[in-house]
Interface confidence: medium
């Protein structure tokens, strides 16, 4: 029987029931009871709250739910040997140290373990050195500095302002010029909103408060230890030597009164342009080394972290499909925190916690999902994404031949102004059609649906009166399953207007300060944000394992795709003259997205016309919309980068928060001017048309009539 | 750091056309992935998209101005332009050009300039 007979509801019935059955109350219950104690990967706590959740989940009404443990390589500081950042004079004597901890914020001072702010997987070390100011430490800052300004970062420490992109990136940049540390600061520029107070009185950052976070460059290997395969019970272990992802220098996070110490008495070059100037009183001069009167001092690093291979536990929650019960939908997000985790990460596990809820409820009443429903509470996302890689590498062939779509739960928000969402292309009409039944909770929406809302805050740069969806990049836990499994993934949550608020993040991201007071004190005092993104990751879920027919418009990948070849073969055009010289062609691709986008036309046409009574042939046409992701899958992987294997999107080489297009070709571009050999560069970017048209082509055919 | 400025007369006759300049300095207009638009703000109303010009060159008008819109672009002088003709006291706005993009945080607008529909 399907899951509709068996109950005599409707699906739309089935869907209402499900969504009124959330509540903000709810929500706003559960984020309190997560975020009173600190639960970093790794510690007694956090296993006690995945036991918690695991009981929690069971009173709610799955059919099951588990603990999957793994041994991991996680990172601590030394707790009698503290991590700090020093000006020493000529004597070596210490004239300035950087502070040792957070004050915490009201009501917290006597809470023990908070961990003091460190780099998660920082090389032990204490270089000492003349500081050069590199100001993101981007790609784009480094060319600046080195080929522009001719300044050597070589043996120096260099300090960068946390901000632009995913600080793993920063630190691999400045490994790549010979910098011998690097210390990272929240400028109030990017980290203290105009005409806000800071924590407590508003959310603004204090000039005490500290981003934490890991500064790895996995590139989706999870486990540094244990690349490709579970870091289980009889796991073989990588010696440190050959981890993958480690930084080779000493990295220390900072905020920015320590920042305002080291910045003032910077000499050397002024800042090129006004983008190397933040807030700070200060010259925001690159150095390298200290001003006329300070010339004789140096900065020195301190620090003493430890790697350790350490237990972490995910919980896996399952309810079981009536139908198709061997087609999963997979709702995750992490549990771990750096500290109190009042946004990252019990925003979005108080969401999850109230949707599990729900559809407990719906069972209990003896509704069944169509398909499987699996929840998941990862562990150990803050230092990398371990617990979701780690799961996924365990279970990769049930994955790969079984799942449908994986929807992510981090924060439910980073703002409170309007939606934001990035999925794949097959999921974009998912969305559109969810957020027009939904309830805006904006002010002055009042009557009107999320859609309404969302489009006139959010606006597409291409299709007037549609909303803004953007790539998948990384930097969470959908990573593995999309760019490594080829699985069709989604994300939303509530944001910020990105028009008037530039600063990156929220400000408190990854301090003592994200507390539950933080969200109902400034962010939602109502819940009523977090309720809407309860409704729209739960209402995509809920569609996804329920609708008869799965639903995916592979019609919006051939936009997308006509869209990414353009931008491709524009970045290539800046090249003429090479494209000549090197006979470079992008016919086949071009050729390849025409004939992906007649095929996707023609499927379409057929998916309404087929007779849906038919279970064989219904099964047929839904398999090959799920496969569809997975046929952008190549099993190589991208160069140098074996565990990101979608051909169309990959986290950008220079961001990994960021998602980059047809990324294969792209980095085969990039810079290919400054090239020692022009000819292999051009060879490469041959190549990686090739792989994509081949691509793009046989994942077409996967639409194809079968026979 | 990209920057945007806007320039024009800010006083136009009705009737007559709506001439306005955006300079970009800090990058390149023919960066691709961008979008170069321009929008407006009615006093004491939400911004109205006018329309943009795609790195590839692809333009996009709204269809309510589409009638009497020109959008270019000179990459040269790394710059694009707006065009408005028979404008009457209801184009009386200020006007902002935008870079956008793809993702999250592309979005870059310059400061403004008050353009009047006046006799």
């Known amino acids: 029987k399907s899951s509709n007979e068996a109950t005599n509801i409707t699906p739309k019935h089935n869907m209402k029931a499900f969504l009124d059955e959330l509540k903000a109350e709810n929500i706003k219950k559960f984020l309190y009871n997560f975020t009173q104690i600190p639960h970093l990967a790794g510690t007694e706590q956090n296993f006690q709250l995945a036991k918690q959740i695991q009981s929690q989940w069971k009173e709610f009404g799955l059919d099951s739910v588990e603990l999957a443990h793994y041994d991991v390589l996680l990172s601590y500081p030394n707790k009698t040997h503290p991590n700090y950042i020093s000006i020493i004079n000529e004597d070596g004597n210490e004239i300035f140290n950087t502070s040792l901890f957070e004050p915490p914020p009201p009501g917290y001072e006597n809470v023990s373990d908070i961990v003091p702010p460190f780099s998660a997987f920082s090389p032990q070390g204490m270089p000492e050195g003349d500081l050069v100011y590199v100001n993101y430490a981007r790609t784009e800052d480094f060319f600046k500095l080195e080929r522009d300004m001719k300044i050597n970062c070589s043996g120096k420490i260099v300090i960068a302002r946390y901000g632009k992109v995913f600080r793993g990136n920063k630190v691999k940049n400045a490994q790549l010029a010979g910098a011998k540390g690097v210390i990272l600061y929240s400028d109030p520029a990017d980290y203290f909103a105009p005409g806000v107070k800071s924590y407590p009185d508003g959310w603004n950052l204090p000039g005490g408060g500290v981003q934490r976070g890991n500064i790895l460059n996995l590139n989706g290997a999870g486990d540094p230890l244990t690349p490709g395969y579970p870091a289980n019970e009889y796991a073989y272990r990588r010696g440190i030597a050959e981890a993958v992802g480690l930084p080779s220098i000493p990295v220390h996070p900072i905020g920015y009164y320590d920042a305002q110490k080291l910045l003032e008495k910077m000499g050397g070059s002024a800042p090129p342009d006004s983008s190397w100037r933040g807030s700070l009183k200060v010259p925001y001069n690159v150095g390298p080394g200290f001003t006329g009167n300070f010339s004789t001092q140096k900065v020195k690093m301190h620090i003493h972290s430890t790697n350790e291979v350490t237990r972490i536990y995910n919980v896996i929650g399952t309810l079981r499909g009536a139908v198709e019960p061997d087609r999963y939908v997979i709702l995750g997000g992490h549990r771990d925190s750096w500290v109190f985790g009042g946004i990252d990460p019990q925003s979005g596990a108080a969401v999850v916690h109230e949707i599990v809820r729900s559809f407990g409820t719906l069972k209990k009443e003896g509704w069944r999902p169509r398909r499987t429903i699996l929840f998941a509470s990862w562990d150990a996302e803050e230092f990398g994404l371990l617990g979701s890689t780690e799961w996924a590498e365990e279970n990769s062939r049930l994955l790969q031949e079984r799942g449908v779509a994986y929807i992510n739960a981090d924060s439910s928000i980073e703002g409170n102004y309007t939606l934001r969402v990035d999925c794949t292309p097959l999921m974009y009409s998912l969305v559109h059609n969810l957020t027009k039944e939904l309830k805006s909770p904006d002010e002055g929406f009042e009557g009107k649906s999320l859609y309404e809302s969302w489009t006139k805050k959010s606006p597409s740069p291409e299709f007037s009166g549609m909303p803004r969806i953007s790539k998948l990049g990384s930097g969470n836990d959908f990573e593995v399953f999309f760019q490594r499994l080829g699985i069709a993934s989604g994300r939303a949550r509530y944001t910020k207007n990105w028009e008037t608020n530039k600063f990156s993040g929220y400000p408190l991201y990854h301090s003592v300060y994200e507390t539950y007071e933080l969200v109902e004190k400034f962010y939602d005092p109502m819940f009523k944000y977090h309720l809407t993104v309860a409704q729209v990751r739960g209402g995509m879920v809920f569609e996804l394992a329920n609708s008869i027919v799965l639903p995916f418009d592979c019609r919006d990948y051939a936009v997308v795709l006509r869209k990414y070849a353009d931008k491709i073969y524009s970045i290539s055009m800046k090249h003429p003259q090479e494209m000549k010289t090197y006979s470079v062609s992008f016919d086949s691709l071009f050729s390849a997205v025409k004939n992906f986008t007649e095929i996707a036309s023609k499927f379409s046409e057929r998916l309404q016309d087929f007779d849906k009574s038919n279970p064989i042939v219904l099964r047929m046409m839904n398999d090959q919309l799920m496969f569809l992701e997975r046929a952008f899958i190549d099993p190589l992987g991208l160069p140098d980068r074996p565990f990101y294997r979608h051909v169309i999107y990959a986290p950008s080489s220079h961001n990994k928060y960021a998602g980059e297009s047809f990324p294969g070709i792209y980095d085969a571009l990039f810079d290919i001017e400054s090239k020692v050999d022009p000819s292999k560069a051009w060879g490469e970017v041959k190549r990686q048309i090739y792989v994509a048209a081949f691509t793009v082509q046989a994942a077409a055919e996967t639409l194809s009539e079968v026979a | 750091q990209v920057q945007l400025q806007e320039s024009g007369p800010g006083l136009v006759k009705p009737s007559q056309t709506l001439s306005l300049t955006c300079t970009v300095s800090g990058g390149s207009i023919s960066n691709s992935g961008y979008y170069w638009s321009w929008v407006r703000q009615h006093p004491g109303k939400g911004l109205e998209w006018i329309g943009f010009i795609y790195y590839n060159g692809s333009i996009h008008y709204n269809p309510s101005l589409k009638s009497r819109v020109t959008i270019s672009v000179d990459t040269s002088k790394n710059q694009f332009s707006l065009k408005l003709s028979s404008v009457t006291a209801a184009d009386t706005a200020v006007y902002y050009c935008?870079?956008?993009?793809?993702?999250?945080?592309?979005?870059?607008r310059g400061q403004g300039t008050l353009v009047t529909v006046s006799s």
């Open positions: 935008a870079r956008d993009g793809d993702d999250y945080g592309d979005y870059l």
